[in-house]
């Protein structure tokens, strides 16, 4: 318990103190007092450095004194032989004696009293930053005007904290700038801008003068900027050492100015402004930004448009562009959206053709359509090569997105006809020599396939049966063979409007316009035994000359039989029409003069008895194409004749090409358009 005074006596005082003694006294006076310790008697064995016996006075860790020997007062009016004044409120006194004393020593008598200390002057470290006021038992600190005493009750500082700056532009300076800033202060300034703006601080070198760093490089006074988890500084010295433009990337900035007790300089002045938060110019592959700018900031909106062949897929919907906004956090909205290659998907299949499974269906991929060669070819050109275009469609250079159309190759027999022996006077043939040959079973006749949906024949073949049964692809027309061949079902029969319908067809003498078309219900699949014949062109190249050779085929009457079971064929030259007129009609049903001969008829035959006959009607008179001699076209259709084995008359198909085309176009299916 602290006391204000006290007495300390050596053991047995005033008798001699014993040997081998160590005794200590802990003196404590109240807080805020010092101790005045004084000795009125001192008689202790003398030794060098008081090594044998001594009284030791210790203040904290410091030895205030060590006494031995004999002392007497120098002042006749005072009994004090030795005294100590310490500004602390604790003191330790230790008495030690060794094992022997040569004489009898009486020890010491000492007294202590609590004394007032002047904290304001008695210490090396001044307790107050500014004004120190001493009183008995303590002191208090006070401050100059405009300063306030900190919570530690010792330090004065200016009231420079708590300012919050929210304006988009402003200026902040150290207290008293440009006069010296206050010592021992911590000034905190807060800049708080609207989200989406970053604080940008600008300083001039000459506007900064803060006490320089110590030898270790530590700032004694410092200016620090803190933006979120980023810190700029500490800065100190003469002239601003940091970047003159600090982009904080944050809308909140704390400015902390810390000063110590010494070395005041003029301080600092800065300007700040709110920059809209920049968003990075991101490298978004396969796209362009509109508008294109060197820098994008908060609230900027860009349209990101995918390059041709790329699209942004959100859910199941594909778009070619999207909008992105520079947000308050410096990040772009919709940043997850990306321009991906357009996917054209699995290409559509086509009739009578194929497309290889593509390795890829993405933008730029290439596919190739092919037709089922050699029976089909690509009608609408373009080569069949399509690439996956930017709009997600498979596109061809010529056709665009339109699919290729595989149409039958016409006029090309798989096996060319060769006369093996000497129809009338003809040779056995194979259906592969005449794959266009169509068999009509009622009446027994022929026709020519001209495309997938149409059969060309003579009008007199179908005038009595508008629903004929037809077969293709068979050399033999035996019932058992026909069962295995392809039967064609008619949808409609179109007889040429110029064909005169008679009540008694058997008595006919006028075969002008002996031509008809049969529209089929279903398309015919082409192959080696079924393939159409070409139609003639309308140019003069397709005008026949006398002597031009043509091929006829059919299952009609031969020299030996009324009807052939196996296909027969013959090669006939074109003859002048007069040659047909000159032949006497075999079984006339009327006067010879009644028979009509017109420019719509071709006369052919007269060579080695080769001719068409009853049952061959409607079959094609096939002539080599004048320009593409690997093909045959239907120059004529077996129509009538004066006498089998001589000359025959054939409908001149060239004169009906317009009617044929018009009829087919007007009665086509959408698939054929």
């Amino acid at each position: 318990e602290p006391t204000m005074y006290g007495e300390i006596l050596s053991p047995n005082y005033p008798q001699a103190y014993p040997s081998e003694v160590e005794k200590s006294w802990d003196i404590e006076v109240p807080e805020g007092y010092g101790i005045h310790l004084y000795f009125t008697h001192l008689d202790i064995e003398l030794s060098e450095n008081c090594a044998y016996d001594s009284v030791q006075i210790i203040s904290g860790d410091t030895e205030e004194g060590r006494l031995c020997g004999q002392r007497s007062s120098n002042n006749p009016h005072s009994p004090i032989v030795e005294e100590f004044q310490v500004p602390y409120n604790k003191l330790q006194v230790i008495f030690k004696s060794d094992f022997s004393n040569e004489e009898r020593f009486t020890g010491f008598a000492a007294y202590y009293v609590a004394t007032d200390i002047n904290e304001c002057t008695d210490f090396v470290d001044v307790p107050c930053s500014h004004f120190c006021n001493n009183f008995i038992g303590g002191y208090f600190c006070s401050c100059p005007p405009e300063y306030f005493l900190h919570d530690d009750m010792k330090n004065c500082g200016v009231n420079c904290s708590g300012d919050v700056f929210t304006a988009l532009i402003g200026e902040i300076a150290s207290p008293n700038y440009p006069k010296p800033y206050p010592e021992n202060s911590r000034c905190e300034y807060q800049i708080r801008l609207e989200k989406g703006f970053q604080v940008v601080v600008t300083l001039r070198r000459e506007d900064f003068d803060v006490e320089a760093a110590d030898s270790a490089g530590n700032c004694l006074d410092s200016l620090v900027f803190v933006a979120g988890d980023r810190q700029f500084g500490p800065y100190c010295g003469h002239g601003f050492p940091g970047p003159l433009n600090i982009e904080t990337k944050s809308n909140a900035l704390d400015i902390i100015f810390q000063t110590d007790l010494t070395g005041q300089k003029k301080g600092w002045k800065l300007r700040y402004h709110g920059d809209p938060m920049p968003c990075p110019k991101e490298d978004t592959p396969n796209s362009v930004w509109e508008p294109a700018k060197a820098k994008y900031v908060f609230r900027d909106v860009v349209q990101i448009t995918c390059l041709d062949g790329f699209e942004v897929v959100e859910g199941r919907v594909g778009a070619t562009s999207f909008y992105s906004t520079c947000q308050s956090n410096g990040k772009w909205s919709n940043s997850k959206l990306k321009c991906q290659p357009v996917d054209c998907g699995i290409p559509e299949s086509i009739e009578n053709g194929k497309v290889e499974d593509p390795e890829s269906t993405l933008f730029g991929s290439v596919i190739r359509y092919t037709c089922e060669e050699p029976y089909y070819y690509m009608e609408n050109g373009g080569g069949g090569e399509y690439h996956c275009a930017g709009n997600g469609s498979w596109v061809n250079e010529v056709l665009g997105p339109e699919l290729p159309k595989c149409v039958p190759v016409c006029g090309v027999p798989r096996e060319p006809f060769e006369e093996k022996q000497r129809i009338i006077g003809g040779s056995d043939a194979d259906i592969k020599n005449f794959p266009w040959q169509v068999f009509f079973d009622n009446p027994w006749a022929g026709g020519a396939l001209i495309n997938e949906y149409w059969v060309l024949t003579a009008a007199h073949v179908v005038e009595g049966n508008r629903e004929p049964t037809m077969y293709v692809g068979s050399t033999s027309v035996q019932t058992s063979r026909l069962a295995k061949s392809k039967m064609l079902t008619p949808e409609h029969v179109f007889i040429h409007p110029g064909w005169k319908l008679l009540e008694v067809p058997e008595g006919r003498t006028n075969f002008d316009n002996d031509i008809a078309l049969v529209r089929l219900k279903d398309p015919v699949k082409m192959g080696p035994t079924v393939s159409p014949i070409c139609l003639p062109g309308t140019s003069s190249d397709y005008n026949l000359m006398d002597g031009d050779l043509g091929l006829i085929s059919g299952w009609g009457r031969t020299e030996k039989r009324d009807r052939a079971v196996r296909l027969k064929a013959a090669r006939l030259p074109v003859a002048p029409l007069r040659k047909c007129k000159e032949v006497k009609v075999e079984k006339p049903t009327a006067d010879a003069e009644a028979y009509v001969f017109t420019p719509n008829m071709i006369c052919a035959g007269g060579e080695k008895g080769m001719d068409s006959c009853k049952g061959d009607s409607g079959g094609a008179f096939a002539v080599q194409d004048p320009n593409d001699k690997t093909k045959f076209y239907a120059a004529g259709l077996v129509s009538w004749g004066p006498q089998c084995g001589t000359y025959g008359l054939y409908t001149r198909v060239k004169n009906y090409v317009d009617w044929i085309m018009k009829t087919m176009q007007e009665n086509s299916t959408p698939r054929e358009d």
């Epitope: 060669e373 050699p374 070819y377 190759v409 090309v412 060319p416 060769e418 006369e419 190249d541 000359m545 006398d546 002597g547 031009d548 050779l549 090669r571 030259p573 074109v574 060579e607 080599q624 004048p626 320009n627 593409d628 001699k629 690997t630 093909k631």
Partner: antibody, heavy 112, light 110 residues
Amino acid sequence: SLEESGGRLVTPGTPLTLTCTVSGFSLSSYTMIWVRQAPGKGLEWIGVVGGSGITYYASWAKGRFTISKTSTTVDLQITSPTTEDTATYFCARDTSVAGDLWGPGTLVTVSS
Amino acid sequence: AYDMTQTPASVEVAVGGTVTIKCQASQSIGVSLAWYQQKPGQRPKLLIYKASNLASGVPSRFKGSGSGTQFTLTISGVECADAATYYCQQDYTYSDVTNIFGGGTKVEIK
């Protein structure tokens, strides 16, 4: 017009392709023939390609030559030339007015 | 097979004279026959098509005739410019053919 190219000196057995480049008409509508003429000899027909791409060859030329076409060219490949194949090779358009259009020819020399 | 035999192999004729060249087909080819003229180092030139039709720009002294298997080219009033080799060509089929051309007839002017 027609123009042959590709003729050169080759060693026996080295395949060689001659090309006939056409302009002014469509190959899809015409028959094109290849004809050759050995030095001091007559015209010898090799083969033909039709508008649809069908080909026919002279009986002696089958297997020795291959004819193919694109939209603007007709090719003749001599699969394994021998010294007897040394000749000027012509391509011609063969129409209803016969060989109405011929190229100038290209010389092929086969020598070891 | 369709083969063409041309005769004679060569012929000499005086200026102003007449030359007759014959061509025979092994099978009937109707009128599908053409005649060509070829001068050394040049491409063949079409003279006659469809057996008897004169090609464009060909002088009327050239005349073709025949049908079926027998055909003839006649050059009347021969001129020096007519010195050349003449070929016939069957224009009917490409199937089963060794050569569509005849062997050629060389016409020399005296």
